[in-house]
């Protein structure tokens, strides 16, 4: 026994164009509200066959009122899980169908009006004990996104709930032969022996020497198929009592069944009877194996060897997702250092490292002043991947072997003379002008435009200048 | 509930050319997988090439640089262009599709693709 349990994360506009009209109005507010039907195995049944293993109606959402001339959003849910309990084992595999209803809330006569907005449906593969599932369905121009998950509930355990557990008759450890209950691990598995020769595939056990089967099979021992056909002969008359098909074109002509499925005439259609690993109402479907190749970029695929089992992906450097599907950006890690430039090559990367820089992420800062001498005395240093030279007074040029002139740039103003001196270069001012560099005006009245006189210095001496 | 039609088997003469084509339609999600398969008489089926979604491709060794499996997504067709066909090409060419995070997928009804010599 155990809970299935569907969380709606939002039912709104789908993607693309043709957006849907909301489905409230400020003259008819309204409010939703969810309805889950659940069948066991992966049988396409009509949705108006029973629900089998289950169903359940959400609560009222919100009352919500359109805003006039905007688009649809996301509408108001209905606060919960929507939980299906089931008694017997559960199946695995098993068929859903949500339905997303309106309640319009206007004043019709005889209380509110209920109409289907949309109706989704699938079959999935689901162990009990896993985590929550996410899934999005798109119905019409309609989009619902949302989670399941099936739980066991105690003392049932595994993936079917089909094990017990039992608190410990003795504190330490387990009896003979019996296993800790994980993931109640201060629980021990019950002993449940099935009747001899209960088929292991299709046939279960809750209590001690019983054999109940999984739907489709049949028999004491759940091991004869379930045929639907009441019929001895296939084209047999008409009867109220046996139900059985009108003369005339079978609905098995022409092999509807896909994969090398086998046709069988029932009262109202036909049934296929699959081969192993195929399913669905035509044989039309499958489970994704490591032989439908769903690795990608080399990929390599590790199990799903046979059609109930999942395969996982081993991507390779480079790649990620759940089919090696996705290109890593590796350059937008930024893994070269000291501004190199990241070449993502696919089986490597490269990074073009900045001059006076080397290594394979440009990590090595070279010694730019290595081998390199400045003449005259002047030092070597380093900067930026090249070497630089600073040359000792009256010299210049990339290896200070040039004699500088220092009056080559004018550097006195106002006319002023230079001359070259040992300590550098000295400027005679025209008259009128005074400073290092002739830039200062001597005004007539004494005073001189001189900047703010620092500390102990009058403005206005131009003695202290010179 | 996918439906899966496919188009364009027939009887080629070795050397020659065929374009295969399956339109998916139904529930088909955003992230998904359309490829071809094949099944020669009395021999498994087998991967032809598949493509991603988002454009990651898959071919078997021994169509490598003859078939090129292309798509397109707003329509959900998948394509598949044989060219320098083989003898051993003859097969039933099954059209399959599946849903990332999915446990089971979609098969064609298949089409025939016979090469003479």
């Known amino acids: 026994a155990g809970v299935f349990e569907l969380q709606i994360h939002s039912f709104g506009p789908g993607p693309g164009p043709g957006a849907p009209r909301s489905p409230c109005s400020a003259r008819l507010p309204c409010r939703l509200f969810f309805r889950v039907c659940l069948k066991p195995g992966l049988s396409e049944e009509a949705a108006e066959s029973p629900c089998a293993l289950g169903a359940a109606l959400s609560a009222r959402g919100p009352v919500y009122t359109e805003q006039p001339g905007a688009p649809a959003p996301d509408l108001p849910l209905p606060d919960g899980l929507l939980q299906v309990p089931f008694r017997d084992a559960w199946p695995g595999t098993f068929s859903f169908i949500i339905e997303t209803w309106r309640e319009e809330l206007g004043d019709q006569i005889g209380g509110p009006a209920w109409s289907l907005l949309a109706r989704v449906a699938g079959r999935r593969r689901l162990a009990a004990g896993g985590p929550w599932a996410r899934d999005i369905q798109r119905a019409g121009a309609w989009e619902l996104r949302f989670s399941y998950r099936a739980r066991c509930e105690p003392p049932a355990v595994g993936t079917a709930c089909t094990r017990l557990c039992r608190p410990r008759s003795a504190p330490s450890r387990c009896g003979p032969g019996l296993r800790p209950c994980a993931p109640l691990e201060d629980e021990c598995e019950a002993p449940l022996v099935c009747r001899a020769g209960c088929s292991p595939e299709h046939g279960f056990c809750e209590q001690p020497g019983e054999c109940r089967c999984l739907e489709g099979w049949t028999g004491p021992l759940c091991t004869v198929p379930v045929s639907t056909s009441s019929c001895l002969s296939p084209r047999g008359p008409s009867s109220a009592t046996t139900g059985c098909l009108v003369p005339g074109p079978g609905p098995c002509d022409g092999n509807p069944c896909a994969n090398g499925g086998s046709c069988s005439e029932t009262p109202r259609s036909f049934e296929c009877t699959c081969p192993r690993g195929f399913y669905g109402l035509r044989c039309e479907v499958s489970g994704v194996t490591c032989a439908d190749g769903p690795c990608f970029n080399g990929g390599l695929c590790v199990g799903g060897a046979d059609p109930d089992s999942a395969y996982i992906c081993h991507c390779p450097p480079g790649f990620q997702g759940s089919n090696c599907e996705k290109r890593v950006d590796r350059c937008s890690l930024q893994p070269c250092r000291n501004g190199g430039l990241c070449l993502d090559l696919g089986h490597a990367l490269r990074c073009r490292c900045r001059a006076g820089f080397a290594g394979p992420r440009c990590e090595h800062d070279l010694d730019d002043c290595a081998g390199r001498a400045c003449a005259n005395g002047g030092t070597c240093v380093e900067g930026g991947g090249a070497h630089r030279c600073s040359c000792a007074l009256g010299f210049g040029g990339r290896d200070c072997r040039e004699r500088a002139d220092p009056c080559a740039a004018r550097p006195c103003a106002h006319g002023g003379r230079c001359y070259a001196h040992f300590s550098g270069l000295v400027c005679a001012c025209a008259p009128g002008y005074m400073g290092a560099r002739c830039e200062f005006p001597v005004h007539p009245d004494g005073a001189s435009a001189l900047p703010a006189a620092p500390p102990g210095l009058r403005p206005g001496d131009p003695q202290r200048y010179l | 509930q996918v439906q899966l039609q496919e188009s364009g088997g027939g009887l080629v003469q070795a050397g020659g050319s065929l374009r295969l084509s399956c339109a998916a339609s139904?529930?088909?999600?955003?992230?998904?997988?359309m490829g071809w398969h094949r099944q020669a008489p009395g021999k498994q089926r087998e991967l032809v090439a598949n493509?991603?979604?988002?454009?990651?491709?898959n071919y078997a060794d021994s169509v490598k640089g003859r078939f090129t499996i292309s798509r397109d997504n707003a329509k959900n067709i998948v394509y598949l262009q044989m060219n320098n066909l083989k003898i051993e090409d003859t097969a039933v060419y099954y059209c399959r599709w599946y849903g990332i995070q999915r446990a089971e997928g979609y098969w064609g009804q298949g089409t025939q693709v016979t090469v003479s010599s």
């Open positions: 139904g529930s088909t999600f955003t992230s998904n997988v």
């Open positions: 493509m991603h979604s988002g454009g990651s491709t």
